[in-house]
Amino acid sequence: NQDLPVIKCVLINHKNNDSSVGKSSSYPMVSESPEDLGCALRPQSSGTVYEAAAVEVDVSASITLQVLVDAPGNISCLWVFKHSSLNCQPHFDLQNRGVVSMVILKMTETQAGEYLLFIQSEATNYTILFTVSIRNTLLYTLRRPYFRKMENQDALVCISESVPEPIVEWVLCDSQGESCKEESPAVVKKEEKVLHELFGTDIRCCARNELGRECTRLFTIDLNQTPQTTLPQLFLKVGEPLWIRCKAVHVNHGFGLTWELENKALEEGNYFEMSTYSTNRTMIRILFAFVSSVARNDTGYYTCSSSKHPSQSALVTIVEKGFINATNSSEDYEIDQYEEFCFSVRFKAYPQIRCTWTFSRKSFPCEQKGLDNGYSISKFCNHKHQPGEYIFHAENDDAQFTKMFTLNIRRKPQVLAEASASQASCFSDGYPLPSWTWKKCSDKSPNCTEEITEGVWNRKANRKVFGQWVSSSTLNMSEAIKGFLVKCCAYNSLGTSCETILLNSPGPFPFIQDNIS
């Protein structure tokens, strides 16, 4: 083992932006940071055969298999895949290491298999074996974490039944509101499954794996906080565990906490209490109400009472199936070109939704914010004043929801013209949709005031570009106007725009644009 490591094998994952078959390359594209594949000498192999850790790749992902050799000078190499030789161009990095790369763009089943790399340097020969397979993500799951009490201990265990095994972390915050945002300095993260410090203001548990990250907040009633104007509501599905924490701080230990469901004390075994002294010698008590697997009859008002604080309640609603409640009627908006505006959807949902905003076949990330009344809101402001159709889509394990929005931007028309041997057409995308006039320019009417009404055909909104309407007007050519200049004008409440067209023989037409506000 004293001759290790002379070579380093790495996997580089790329952000997809191209498609091709595997190709040998010395300069891969922009990428994520390299992952060490720990090339180890293959036991019981004749010669110097190194084996990289197996590589699992998502379908359509782009990767680079890379080998770094600490052998400057002349090196030659050859890739072999499925009995075919692939060309190989080594280069040297700043540190004089030989670099050999194999880029696999848009991974497919045909590109999975064993990649053999033969390297010949002045000093030694190396054979490196990479095994690349397609990751079976169909079997992957990421479930929202839930809480369990640790046996014989005052501690909570966070569980997420996910594949692959997720990394579980507790996210703790002792501040209020905005300062408990994920990246705030007030937030402390603990990458462990068991939590003993249960007195904090805000406690969440998150689980993450290749599919993403899911979090569950420990539902808390704080008797020292002013109650919300609307009763806090907690939704659960039948069979899920219920956890509610009641927290109270008092100048001394002379107070107690109790839980009631619909005015009946909770049964023993459905609650446990913890207490501690805070830094200023006040007493903090917390009382957990929990049901390991809820049924419909666990629905109701859970009230936490204290001998020294006003009691507070939460409504627990047990549902058979998840839901998304929101109005799905489409909404149309009309705004000025520089007006600040955001689309917003207010909804109530359980379990928490995953959502996207879509415009012009492009998806945008979707943020949700919880409101005090149990509703959540998602806003989209990144429309860059582009008119058209915007779609909000939300889903959870049990429900789906889609809502359509149309955005119209008030602006004066812009006219485009085209002509053929038999007709001239003008198009405009202004809003409100413009009206059209055609005028003939002649010796009698050098200012083009002679209106043309014959042979004009207006089509309102004949072409819908991602919800953006385009209006057009067509003038059929007649002997009376052939050889003349004609002017088409589009006008709406914000202004007028015109194009002048010379109606002669077919071919490229000269267009003169007039802008009249």
Epitope: V6, D36, D70, A71, G73, L94, N96, A123
Partner: antibody, heavy 118, light 106 residues
Framework: EVQLQESGAELVKPGASVKLSCKAS????????INWLKQRPGQGLEWIGN????????NYNEKFKNKATLTVDTSSSTAYMQLSSLTSDDSAVYYC???????????WGQGTTLTVSS | QIVLTQSPAIMSASPGEKVTMTCSAS?????MHWYQQKSGTSPKRWIF???KLASGVPVRFSGSGSGTSYSLTITNMETEDAATYYC?????????FGGGTKLEIK
């Protein structure tokens, strides 16, 4: 076991030259870069340069280009560093170290103390 | 040349205490390596590729960071951990070292 054995302490006069040695054992000498580093008392480490015994490719830190000369003798698996035109600024502990492909130094010599004094 | 700045230059900790020292690079580097050096001895490789422990290094040591900011942490300081720790990068043509953090026992 990988070992780098450096030559003993040197006391030399200003203006003179000195040749330090580093004998490698326990691995294939021609497969790894030998690096030389300088450490003044109570100070950090400075990289002087490196040499690849397999093809005698040499790199120098710009600062030491006119100060150090690196050579190897593959038959005895020994690397050498000659320091010329010595001044009191060259008084330091000099280490040879083996570089691995991960770009760190995995094995170090015990160091040679060089004192330049009249 | 990439300059590495280690802080603090000197620190002391009691046994059992958590210790964190940092290494800041003047421009972004791919990996950071760490060495431990005790008085009168040569440096020992300690952490490589930012977070991998060299063989024989106790698991109470850990390394992390990216870009221009890296750190070495000891979860439970022990007396044998008293030493000077150097960070090192080789993302540029020449490798450079930080000035070292001297960790003393309280």
């Amino acid at each position: 076991e990988v070992q780098l054995q450096e030559s003993g302490a040197e006391l030399v006069k200003p203006g003179a030259s000195v040749k330090l040695s580093c004998k490698a054992s326990g691995y294939t000498f021609t497969n790894y870069w030998i690096n030389w580093l300088k450490q003044r008392p109570g100070q950090g480490l400075e990289w002087i340069g490196n040499i690849y015994p397999g093809s005698t490719i040499i790199n120098y830190n710009e600062k030491f280009k006119n100060k150090a000369t690196l050579t190897v003798d593959t038959s005895s698996s020994t690397a050498y560093m000659q320091l010329s035109s010595l001044t009191s600024d060259d008084s330091a502990v000099y280490y040879c170290a083996r570089r691995v492909v991960y770009l760190y130094f995995d094995s170090w010599g015990q160091g040679t103390t060089l004192t330049v004094s009249s | 040349q990439i300059v590495l700045t280690q802080s603090p230059a000197i620190m002391s900790a009691s046994p059992g205490e958590k210790v964190t020292m940092t290494c800041s690079a003047s421009s972004s580097v791919s990996y950071m390596h760490w060495y431990q050096q005790k008085s009168g001895t040569s440096p020992k490789r300690w952490i490589f590729d930012t977070s991998k422990l060299a063989s024989g290094v106790p698991v109470r040591f850990s390394g992390s960071g990216s870009g221009t900011s890296y750190s070495l942490t000891i979860t439970n300081m022990e007396t044998e951990d008293a030493a000077t720790y150097y960070c090192q990068q080789w993302s540029s043509k020449s490798p450079t070292f930080g000035g070292g953090t001297k960790l003393e026992i309280k």
